[in-house]
Amino acid sequence: MRTEAQVPALQPPEPGLEGAMGHRTLVLPWVLLTLCVTAGTPEVWVQVRMEATELSSFTIRCGFLGSGSISLVTVSWGGPNGAGGTTLAVLHPERGIRQWAPARQARWETQSSISLILEGSGASSPCANTTFCCKFASFPEGSWEACGSLPPSSDPGLSAPPTPAPILRADLAGILGVSGVLLFGCVYLLHLLRRHKHRPAPRLQPSRTSPQAPRARAWAPSQASQAALHVPYATINTSCRPATLDTAHPHGGPSWWASLPTHAAHRPQGPAAWASTPIPARGSFVSVENGLYAQAGERPPHTGPGLTLFPDPRGPRAMEGPLGVR
């Protein structure tokens, strides 16, 4: 599912509509409609491959399918980074690559994909059902992570197909702010269109004074409140033993399965930073208990046995630490 936020040139409205609503009133609905229809959700894919030459040597490939610019990639094993996983490599597009054993060679393949070769020997070598996770921090989408592992009966030299299994690292601020504004906008748009349809249009005099609309501000929680904003995300059971289903419900909330769009406004750079944040391709949302928005009609992500839901112990803005991410 590669959907990029592309805002096409606005089509001129019908003459009757322009007369009815006026030029100013028209621009907002069209912009909102364009955003509602065209914007998409980024995704991370992970591919794990066992080398035929060295049976315990792995190649992990990860990519980011989104329109934002990547600011950092973290590859971990044994689970997501910061949630029991061990960091294997960190790749910064401008600062270079850092890696730790058993990682042997991490590299950028393209500007949005990376690969990592793991050593096959020693106490820290991976085993066949180890889970590898890739986390992409990007602007403006925020932080996205996906995990993958070899299927239990993989032949050497074969690879698991790329698994687009996005893991939630949602920034509540981004979700509530962006999704909320756009949801409101879509509802408002429908309201305007219905109103136009159901009543005659009075002639509007063009206003001489056009008061400036207040500029949208990107909302960010204070540091003190960040600790409480843990967003659950999913991963696949990791250790070298049979996987078991283990579901935790953060904050005692309900057990729920949904593909949740993550609209993290990552280091919003301007008052109108939300405008360029991707939104789901389908405009219908279903509200979930903790304030996240799940897309209606979308099946739960396909994950293997041992799906675990747990909060990020480092909080929703884990990738926005003071270091490394620029």
Epitope: R95, G96, W100, Q111, P322
Partner: antibody
Framework: QVQLQQPGAELVKPGTSVKLSCKAS?????SYWINWVKLRPGQGLEW???????????NYNEKFLNKATLTTDTASSTAYMQLNNLASEDSAVYYC???????WGQGTTLIVSA | DIVMTQSPSSLSVSAGEEVIMSCKSS????????????LAWYQQKPGQPPKLLIY???TRESGVPDRFTGSGSGTDFTLTINNVQAEDLAIYYC?????????FGGGTKLEIK
């Protein structure tokens, strides 16, 4: 704000060992790696190695493989570098720096003298 | 190991002048995937730890004045300081950010007349 605290100075005898510390604060210690850098007057900066807290496989500059041992204690958010079999050429200022050398400690001056 | 060579080893200029210092690497610092050159510059003032000035050859770290400009690619890089100020008195190091071990140049000492 981000801080890396290092002791100001250590005076040790040749042939002994010393364990230098670097206490991190102001960020999540397990989110970024710690580098160690040596500075000798007139000789410039030398990268000794780096360690990611929680990953027990540090990287070393080969030149320091038998000299330095890097460890971390996540409970106290502290990184350590042990230098063994000290000699006069080990006298230098040793810095710790986090991540991509974004933040640096003030450095520990190590004096190896009989 | 990648060897980083800086020149000149020291230079003395008057305030307001322009300074250009060079850094050469024994191997290319270009990353083929990102098409970025992984070279960083640091400033070390007397009695202080080094401070990151520029990374990725030309990207200024936040808070660094735009008087400091990095350029170059492959194996040849330069740091230019326009309108030198008294507070720029320091040793400037270039660093291979490309591959282990992360080697530094010998430094260029900038003195103000």
């Amino acid at each position: 704000q981000v801080q890396l605290q290092q002791p100001g100075a250590e005076l040790v005898k040749p042939g002994t060992s010393v364990k230098l510390s670097c206490k991190a604060s102001g960020y999540n210690f397990t989110s970024y790696w710690i580098n160690w850098v040596k500075l000798r007057p007139g000789q410039g900066l030398e990268w000794i190695g780096d360690i990611y807290p929680g990953n027990y496989s540090p990287n070393y500059n080969e030149k320091f493989l038998n000299k330095a041992t890097l460890t971390t204690d996540t409970a106290s958010s502290t990184a350590y570098m042990q230098l063994n079999n000290l000699a006069s050429e080990d006298s230098a200022v040793y810095y710790c720096a986090s991540g991509y050398f974004d933040y640096w400690g003030q450095g520990t001056t190590l004096i190896v003298s009989a | 190991d990648i060897v980083m060579t800086q020149s000149p080893s020291s230079l003395s200029v008057s305030a307001g002048e322009e300074v250009i210092m060079s850094c050469k690497s024994s191997q290319s610092l270009l990353n083929s995937g990102t098409q970025k050159n992984y070279l960083a510059w640091y400033q070390q003032k007397p009695g202080q730890p080094p401070k990151l000035l520029i990374y990725g050859t030309s990207t200024r770290e936040s808070g660094v004045p735009d008087r400091f400009t990095g350029s170059g690619s492959g194996t040849d890089f330069t740091l230019t300081i326009n309108n030198v100020q008294a507070e720029d008195l320091a040793i400037y190091y270039c660093q291979n950010d490309h591959s282990y071990p992360y080697t530094f140049g010998g430094g260029t000492k900038l003195e103000i007349k």
